[in-house]
């Protein structure tokens, strides 16, 4: 049986099938006659009962509320009610990244030590009966693997294995084709005693902004205790009074390394802040790694249709 949705806060990507499963499912079967209701509330709207008539995209099955697919306007709080049992979820539906085969905010980061075993298996237990094909991509390039149903990588890690692995499941429902993407950011580290510091996320980031508004550029890295993380911008740092480097935050990982985060806050964005590089660098005895941010006026961000899957 598929596990229930126990996490109270959930982020999903628009356009994908999605489901909520309440956690008193076995109980619900025992009391078939009991009234079971699903509700949604968002903003000014108070509890609105959901049923298949609410939307052609919504389906109710026993313990599950399904979305075919989930869309941005599905963001809100959801409730399941049965007798004196209530379960609540807060759902945040985010925009799909149309420039890539995956959406950055929906990436699961994993650290693998070099020469240690790891396995990526493209499986989706809830939708498996509906999936008619599945592809595995590395950095948005399709990997040619034997198994078309559950593509799998099983190996001892090498440094060249580092990258973004996206499992894309293609499925049909009511005559329509959908896809579900699950992406892992695999970071290969030397060993637990000494890692090569790495900045998390893409090397080049275009950030859509509005003039006069504020923006926070977050730079995160996996590093050793003695490594440093810093921002570089303009001819000399500090020349722009609207730019502030916030205090660095560090959290120790279970394997004794550090996850550091440093935010660059740009207030009252002006023309001079657009189309220039804001560089974040992590430095250690083993070398440096840099990622760049470029602020782009919202209107200038072209909407490229379709997914960027390369074969």
């Amino acid at each position: 049986a598929e596990s229930c949705t126990s996490r109270p806060h959930i982020t999903v990507v628009e356009g994908e099938p999605f489901y909520l499963k309440h956690c008193s499912c076995s109980l619900a079967h025992e009391i078939e006659t009991t009234t079971k209701s699903w509700y949604k509330s968002s903003g000014s709207q108070e509890h609105v009962e959901l049923n298949p008539r609410s939307s052609s995209r919504i389906a109710l099955h026993d313990c599950v509320l399904e979305f075919w697919p989930v869309e941005l306007n599905d963001t809100g709080s959801y409730f399941f009610q049965m007798k004196n049992y209530t379960q609540k979820w807060k759902l945040n539906v985010i925009r799909r990244n149309k420039h890539s085969c995956f959406t950055e905010r929906q990436v699961t980061s994993k650290i693998v030590e070099v020469k240690k075993f790891f396995q990526i298996t493209c499986e989706n237990s809830y939708y498996q009966t509906l999936v008619n094909s599945t592809s595995l991509y590395k950095n948005c390039k399709k990997l040619l693997l034997e198994n078309n149903k559950n593509p799998t990588i099983k190996k001892n890690a090498e440094f060249e294995d580092q990258g973004y692995y996206s499992c894309v499941h293609f499925l049909h429902h009511n005559g329509k084709l959908f896809n579900i993407t699950k992406t892992f950011n695999i970071t290969i580290v030397e060993d637990r005693s000494n890692i090569v510091p790495v900045l998390l996320g893409p090397k080049l980031n275009h950030v859509a902004v509005e003039l006069g508004k504020n923006v926070r550029l977050n730079c995160s890295a996996l590093l050793n205790e003695e490594d440093v993380i810093y921002w570089m911008f303009g001819e000399e740092n500090g020349s722009d009074p609207n730019i502030h480097e916030e205090k660095e935050m560090r959290i120790m990982t279970p394997e004794g390394k550090w996850h550091a985060s440093k935010v660059l806050r740009i207030e009252n964005i002006g023309e001079s802040n657009l189309n220039v590089l804001y560089n974040c660098t992590v430095a250690s005895t083993g070398g440096t790694d840099t990622k760049s941010f470029i602020l782009v006026r919202k209107a200038d961000m072209a909407d490229i249709p379709g997914h960027v899957f390369t074969r």
Epitope: C4, T108, I111, F118, Q119, S125
Partner: nanobody, 127 residues
Framework: DVQLQESGGGLVQAGGSLRLSCAAS?????????IGWFRQAPGKKREEVSC?????????YYADSVKGRFTISRDNANNTVYLQMNSLKPEDTAVYYC??????????????????WGQGTQVTVSS
């Protein structure tokens, strides 16, 4: 979030046995999570002991130092994962942690792959 609780630790003579349990609180169903047992001895790095994958526990892993002595298993009815430790040695002395990872599709037995951790239970093996 997932909350894990280890139990079953204690003091035992070399050659003896212990069974550690890892239970989840609330509505979390452990059968949908990869579970790992890790240990940390004073002054040493945390190391992997044994791991079991989700989806029916099809994959298991044992560190070389415990192969043939330790067994990892699931009891889905009781929402618990066990680590049966036989023929214990003084070098098995450590704090034992259980950890869970719900990232369906990825599996490894390294602490960097696990997102949720218990508080740990002390195992002391006297000679």
């Amino acid at each position: 979030d997932v909350q894990l609780q280890e139990s079953g630790g204690g003091l035992v003579q070399a050659g003896g046995s212990l069974r550690l349990s890892c239970a989840a609180s609330g509505f979390t169903l452990l059968d949908s999570y990869d579970i790992g047992w890790f240990r940390q001895a004073p002054g040493k790095k945390r190391e992997e002991v044994s791991c079991i994958s989700s989806s029916g526990g099809k994959s298991t892993y044992y560190a070389d130092s415990v192969k043939g002595r330790f067994t990892i298993s699931r009891d889905n009815a009781n929402n618990t994962v066990y680590l049966q430790m036989n023929s214990l040695k003084p070098e098995d002395t450590a704090v034992y942690y259980c950890a869970a990872d719900g990232a369906e599709g990825f599996w490894s037995c390294q602490s960097g792959g696990y997102d949720y951790w218990g508080q740990g239970t002390q195992v002391t093996v006297s000679s």
